[in-house]
Each structure stands twice: as structure tokens, then as C-alpha cells.
Amino acid sequence: AAPCPDACCPHGSSGLRCTRDGALDSLHHLPGAENLTELYIENQQHLQHLELRDLRGLGELRNLTIVKSGLRFVAPDAFHFTPRLSRLNLSFNALESLSWKTVQGLSLQELVLSGNPLHCSCALRWLQRWEEEGLGGVPEQKLQCHGQGPLAHMPNASCGVPTLKVQVPNASVDVGDDVLLRCQVEGRGLEQAGWILTELEQSATVMKSGGLPSLGLTLANVTSDLNRKNVTCWAENDVGRAEVSVQVNVSFPASVQLHTAVEMHHWCIPFSVDGQPAPSLRWLFNGSVLNETSFIFTEFLEPAANETVRHGCLRLNQPTHVNNGNYTLLAANPFGQASASIMAAFMDNPFEFNPEDPIPVSFSPVDTNSTSGDPVEKKDETPFGVSVAVG
């Protein structure tokens, strides 16, 4: 094949080699960019910056080599459009540093930086960590920091990510209240900070205020949906990113629901309880306190991480006719009390049938459902039996 006279020439089915001295000063408009999986660049002393726009359209790129060139700066978001990048060779350029953000989100199997005048500072703590952990082939390169010594020896005691403290209200928060959160950010070289509120949706009206090092957040007219939702403060410096999540507990009265008994391994009377703080529960059977045993007991399902409602069963192990009757679940917290009742018939009384009647072969429970989910005022003298905390 005739030698390729262009600055960049095809290499294999999806590769490109740009090796003609000084032919490039940027990577805009590379031919066939959208299908490239491999890009090799060498001897491009005018190629000094690698920015987001340079690699736009190179979504299939897996191997990028820029060597013996003039690269001085790689933007933190330079590889945003190349998520499949797995090998990155930037050796023998003029890089003094490389941000942790540059490689964040990539699954790099190989990162080559040897032959650059790296300067050891906390901004390279992430690279030192790669060296310590044997990642990306970094240890084999024995990277040196210009004027200082091996990267491995860089002192790092002061190279921490930001420290975050989020202040939440001590006092009880009620539905409709306004809540002020404050995120105090400490640390060296702070760059950016903010709030992540993706879980909040319609739980409150959000107003942000302030900036580094103290960020404010007002949650106005909060609803009970705010419970168990993460409010996250984040901050970044040249070392990395820190996040702290808090939850605001919005008080609301207990509520309860009972459902028709179902036969599973044991019989189950399904229930749902809600409230903040988590209500305590008591069961009544035919109006009297039900003492739980290994045959009749409360069992909770695994709670959902982002909601206060708890689901569970009153489990009955091989109930007989003596267990037929009216089951009431009482739920109470400091803001109110609620109850729900259900009739359950597990088995007919074998001693109450007419000898003339045909003997029944199977039974299905006959339930009548009466639920009063509205909170009622808590009276201290109400007699309660077994107490189960919902946490």
C-alpha cells in the first residue's frame, strides 16, 4: 500500500494513527471519528490541551495513546464522551498534574503517565493510591515527581477530601413546617459543593442559600413523605469528593391497616402501620390483650429504605377454631393512636355441627373487615398489652 500522506492515517479496521511531526494542534474533526476504537498520536508538540470538545463523537474509543507530544493539560471532563475507554497512554508529554475527575467514571485497565514532569501535590493523591493498590499498571511505572522524588514517597497526611458536617434541627418537625439545614464544609483547596435532592420530589419546597464553606438549604412546607428521604451535601477538592446524607424526621400520627387473613406456610393476618416516630403496636383478640407466643407472633417484612410504612403479619401457626374471632391492631405514637379490626375464621368448631349435615371437606375463612384508620386522641388510661416497636 502507498504511504499515507495525511496527518492521520487509518490503522486496521477501526484505528487511526497520527504521527506526522507537528501536524495536529487539536483533535477536532478526525476522519471517521464515530467508529474509532483506537487512536494513536505521536510527535504532536502543538497538541497542548485535551478538552471535552476534542473527544466528542468518539463514543466507541477504547484505546487512546498520546505520546511524545506537547500535552500540558487534560480537562477534568475530557473523557466524558468516551465512557468505554480502557487504555490511556499519555507518556512523555508535559503533564504536571492530572485531576482525579479525569479518570472518574472510566474503567481504565491501563493508565501510563511515565515521562511527564509530574508535580507531587495533593492533586495526585488519587494516583498515589492507584500505585499503592496496584491499579492500571501504575506501580510498574515507578512514577517520579519532578524535582521531588518518587510519587510513592509523597507525604499525604494532609491530603484529605473535604470534611462535611450537616446540621439538622434538634426539635421535632411537623407536617407544614419549614426546615433549615446547614452544611459546613472544611478542608483544603475546596473547589465545588452543593446539595443532591433527587429523592425529595414533592416532599417539600426547596430553597438553596449560601456557598462555600457554609451551604444553606430550606425545606419549606414539609410533608410526611420527606421521612426516610436522603438529603445529601457534597463537596470536592483536588483530592476527591465527599458526600454526607441526612434524613429529616417529620412527625405524623400513627395509622394502621389490616387485610384479610391468608394461608401461607402459617396463617397470616397482613397489616401496614405508619407514623413518625415509629408507632408501638398491640394486638387484641376479641377485645382482650393478645399475648404473643411462638405459635402466634408479629413478624415484619424487610422495610423499604425510603419510606416509614412497615408491613408485616400476625403469624398464626396451625390455628384452630379457638383462634377464630375479632383481631384488632392498635398503633400509637406521641402524635396519635389508630386501630383496625378484622374478623378471621380459620376453622369451624368441630363440636358445633348437625349430624344430619354433610361433613365439610375444606374451609375458607369468612372475614368481615372493619378499619378505622383515623388517628384518635391518645388516652393514657387505655389498657395495652404486648408492645412491639416498629424500627
Epitope: 504536571e96 514532569p117 508535580h119 501535590s121 495533593c122 517520579q144 519532578h146 524535582g147 521531588q148 522524588g149 518518587p150 514517597h153 509523597m154 507525604p155 497526611a157 494532609s158 491530603c159 483544603r188 483547596g189
Partner: antibody, heavy 119, light 106 residues
């Protein structure tokens, strides 16, 4: 013990060049970066540049780009700093100093070489 | 380049005094280094990585600070402490020095 011994005082005319030497002993010369710092009379300290004798990799303060040349002779464990196109404001004491990476600081300094630029 | 500002540029103190020298960097640095220099002599490393005393430095000296503000403190000034003290950073390239603080006898 680790020692850096520098060449003697020099008097030069403006426009001339001067080459200051720094002989190292007591440690592995090729594995530590050597730096050069100067101090004008009654003034503070100013960094000139650095060289890694192991591979002669070097870099200079932008202020001295093109005028300061750093070299190293590993056979004699000697580092050199040559400053060309001298002017009167280059009159200063020139120091070599080792960057000790185990504790990450300039731990040993030469005694200094006085360079006077005068017509 | 990171600028290093030392204050005061000179101070007069008596033997036994507590002396504090401050160094402010134009942007955040990881560590601060201090050197002592006496007339006609090369600088001597005095405090490295903010708070570590170099070999032979008396325990009356201490260093502290973080971010942009750092301090060298002499708890009880002795006759041999009269000298000029320089701060230096090597967090950012190139290394830069403060203008010096001359500690003189009152």
C-alpha cells in the same frame, strides 16, 4: 555524612557566563533531585531550577528559561549550574541543595558560591 | 506561582520572649517548610512538613497551620535564635519562598 561542596567565588562582566559546580558525597547522587537557589545581597531566596542526575531530566524557573543550564556528571557526582548573559542583577550567592524525598524537604545545602557581575 | 507573604518582616525581642512568625500563601498548600539563616551562612532546614523539627532543632520551636496560614513559634527565645527565618512551599510548582523575618535583639 551527606555533603555538598561548591566551587569558589566568581567575578564576571555583564554578558558573560558563569558555571558553578556542586560536588556531592555521602549518598547516592543519581537518586535525588538537586536544586539550585540564589540569594541577592540583603534579599530573600529565589528558586532557579532542578536536575535529576539519574537521567539528566531538568526544569527551570520560567524567569531563567534559556539562561540557566543545569547538568550533572555522575562519574564525579557533581552538579553544575551555568548562567549566561549575565547582568548586574544576577549578583548573588548561588546555592545547591538536595531534595530529600524520604522526608520531603531540602535537607542539605552547599556553602554557597558568590557570583559578582560588574563591569 | 504561589506567593508567600511573611509577617512581620522584622521583629525585636528579648531573651525568654515568646515569638510568633506567620506565613500566608496566596492559595492553599499542603505543607509549609521553614529555614533558619544566619549572616554569611547557607539556610538550614528548621521545620519540615509544617510541624516536624529538623535534626538538631531545639524543642522550643514549633510549627503549625493548614491551608493558607502557617506559623512558626519560639516558646522562649534564646540568644542563638537570633537569625532570619524563611518559609517555603513546594505544594505547587515552582517552589517559592517567603521574604524572610529577621529576629533581632531588643
Amino acid at each position: 555524612q551527606v555533603q555538598l561542596v561548591q566551587s569558589g567565588a566568581e567575578v564576571k562582566k555583564p554578558g558573560a557566563s558563569v558555571k558553578v559546580s556542586c560536588k556531592a558525597s555521602g549518598y547516592s547522587f543519581t537518586t535525588y533531585w538537586m536544586h539550585w537557589v540564589r540569594q541577592a545581597p540583603g534579599q530573600g531566596l529565589e528558586w532557579i531550577g532542578t536536575i535529576y542526575p539519574g537521567n539528566s531530566d531538568s526544569s527551570n524557573n520560567q524567569k531563567f528559561k534559556g539562561r540557566a543550564t543545569l547538568t550533572a556528571d555522575t562519574s564525579t557526582s557533581t552538579a553544575y549550574m551555568e548562567l549566561s548573559s549575565l547582568r548586574s542583577e544576577d549578583t548573588a550567592v548561588y546555592y545547591c541543595t538536595r531534595f530529600y524525598y524520604e522526608d520531603w524537604y531540602f535537607d542539605v545545602w552547599g556553602q554557597g558560591t558568590m557570583v559578582t557581575v560588574s563591569s | 506561582d504561589i506567593q508567600m507573604t511573611q509577617s512581620p518582616s522584622s521583629l525585636s525581642a528579648s531573651v525568654g520572649d515568646r515569638v510568633t512568625i506567620t506565613c500566608s500563601a496566596s492559595s492553599s498548600v499542603s505543607y509549609m517548610y521553614w529555614f533558619q539563616q544566619k549572616p554569611g551562612k547557607a539556610p538550614k532546614p528548621w521545620i519540615y512538613r509544617t510541624s516536624n523539627l529538623a535534626s538538631g532543632v531545639p524543642s522550643r520551636f514549633s510549627g503549625s497551620g493548614s491551608g493558607t496560614d502557617y506559623t512558626l513559634t519560639i516558646s522562649s527565645l534564646q540568644p542563638e535564635d537570633f537569625a532570619t527565618y524563611y518559609c517555603q512551599q513546594y505544594h505547587s510548582y515552582p517552589p517559592t519562598f517567603g521574604g524572610g523575618t529577621k529576629v533581632e535583639i531588643k
